[in-house]
């Protein structure tokens, strides 16, 4: 058993049918010694008397808010949550496996640049009685500070007869050095509590591996005289690291016909312009990627040929 926060305790339960459970001793936070009784949640049934209460925690029915009283007055509370292990594996019931980039991916994180700021998000089908707490650091043995905000509900989606909720959090490395080579990964830890269930989820990554630039901005077409060709130009996104001479991007320019089946023409360039043939009813799209490190491509910025 360990303390999650004041008066909230997590009982780690290695569960299997007929498991003996965990013996837990609760102590009433009071100088009083006599006439103390204990109850669980809203029930008036007296579970025991005395300054301490010993309980055997076998299942969620044994968790909840234990209260000690004296003469009708509440003395203190202890909320017991369960962290359940089955077949040697801690439960992961609260969050949905996003299965990208691999199975058992519950947290996904992205950074728009090398400033040390990043966003993580996760999915759940649970709509109520749910709280998250996020901590982060650079390295784990001698951790350097990363400050995370509060997790917020960022999107709701309907998938079949299921509603899916996306939560996200923004974090900032306290002493980020954008140009430095990373040797220690960022660690992100999410505590999730649903009703009386506690679970924790972790992710470990280098900022360079989670980079995903914003799409190029100010995408424009300039027709070339007496030609079907156009000059496409764009700019680095505002959110990308500076100076651009050091933090350089490479670009992919694509001409896509109206039909998805039509052949796509693609051009790769390090410049912020390219000359392509603009077909009728086609559109031109440009996306960006770090020039020197193969992290994710940005989303596409697009304009119609006409």
């Amino acid at each position: 058993i360990w303390e999650l926060k004041k008066d909230v305790y997590v009982v780690e339960l290695d569960w299997y049918p007929d498991a003996p459970g965990e013996m837990v001793v609760l102590t009433c936070d009071t100088p009083e010694e006599d006439g103390i009784t204990w109850t669980l949640d809203q029930s008036s049934e007296v579970l025991g008397s005395g300054k301490t209460l010993t309980i055997q925690v076998k299942e969620f029915g044994d968790a909840g808010q234990y209260t000690c009283h004296k003469g009708g007055e509440v003395l203190s509370h202890s909320l017991l949550l369960l962290h359940k292990k089955e077949d040697g594996i801690w439960s992961t019931d609260i969050l949905k496996d996003q299965k990208e980039p691999k199975n058992k991916t519950f947290l996904r994180c992205e950074a728009k640049n090398y400033s040390g700021r990043f966003t993580c998000w996760w999915l759940t089908t649970i709509s109520t009685d749910l709280t998250f707490s996020v901590k982060s650091s650079r390295g784990s043995s001698d951790p350097q500070g990363v400050t995370c905000g509060a997790a917020t509900l960022s999107a709701e989606r309907v998938r079949g007869d299921n509603k899916e909720y996306e939560y996200s959090v923004e974090c900032q490395e306290d002493s980020a050095c954008p140009a430095a080579e990373e040797s220690l990964p960022i660690e992100v830890m999410v505590d999730a509590v649903h009703k009386l269930k506690y679970e924790n989820y972790t992710s470990s990554f280098f900022i360079r591996d989670i980079i995903k630039p914003d799409p190029p901005k100010n995408l424009q077409l300039k027709p070339l005289k007496n030609s079907r060709q156009v000059e496409v130009s764009w700019e680095y996104p505002d959110t990308w690291s500076t100076p651009h001479s050091y933090f350089s991007l490479t670009f992919c320019v694509q001409v896509q016909g109206k039909s998805k089946r039509e052949k796509k023409d693609r051009v790769f360039t390090d410049k912020t312009s390219a000359t392509v043939i603009c077909r009728k009813n086609a559109s031109i799209s440009v996306r960006a990627q770090d020039r020197y490190y193969s992290s994710s491509w940005s989303e596409w910025a697009s304009v119609p040929c006409s």
């Epitope: 569960w15 299942e59 969620f60 029915g61 089908t125 007869d161 649903h194 009386l196």
Partner: nanobody, 123 residues
């Protein structure tokens, strides 16, 4: 919001078997841990057993262990309670319930309830 409808209750002789079904609609059945409870007249609702969302683990009240078996078919959105070697003391209204906490024998840990199906075991 999940709706639950029990079926399969009836009158049987002691020692016989019965299978109860509980059909779920209106929500994603495979997200929920499912439980069976029973209530005889003049008594409190009593835990029978529960099955986890994947159907890989079950947990039973001591008095039904070895006689009752809970299973589920997530493709059919249905949970079953197979009862054998029935005794007169098994006579009760049987309810199925859906919740998020497994295992729990406490009725308030379940969020959705069916209307119940009556089982009568005569000696």
């Amino acid at each position: 919001e999940v709706q639950l409808v029990e079926s399969g209750g009836g009158v049987v002789q002691a020692g016989e078997s019965l299978r109860l079904s509980c059909a779920a609609s209106g929500g994603s059945f495979s997200n929920y841990e499912m439980g069976w409870f029973r209530q005889a007249p003049g008594t409190e609702r009593e835990f029978v057993g529960t099955i986890n969302r994947r159907g890989s683990s079950t947990y039973y009240e001591d008095s039904v262990k070895g006689r009752f078996t809970i299973s589920r078919d997530n493709a059919k959105n249905t949970v079953y309670l197979q009862m054998s070697s029935l005794k007169p003391e098994d006579t009760a209204n049987y309810y199925c319930a859906a919740g998020w906490l497994y295992p729990s024998s406490r009725s308030r840990d379940y969020d959705y309830w069916g209307q119940g199906t009556q089982v009568t075991v005569s000696s």
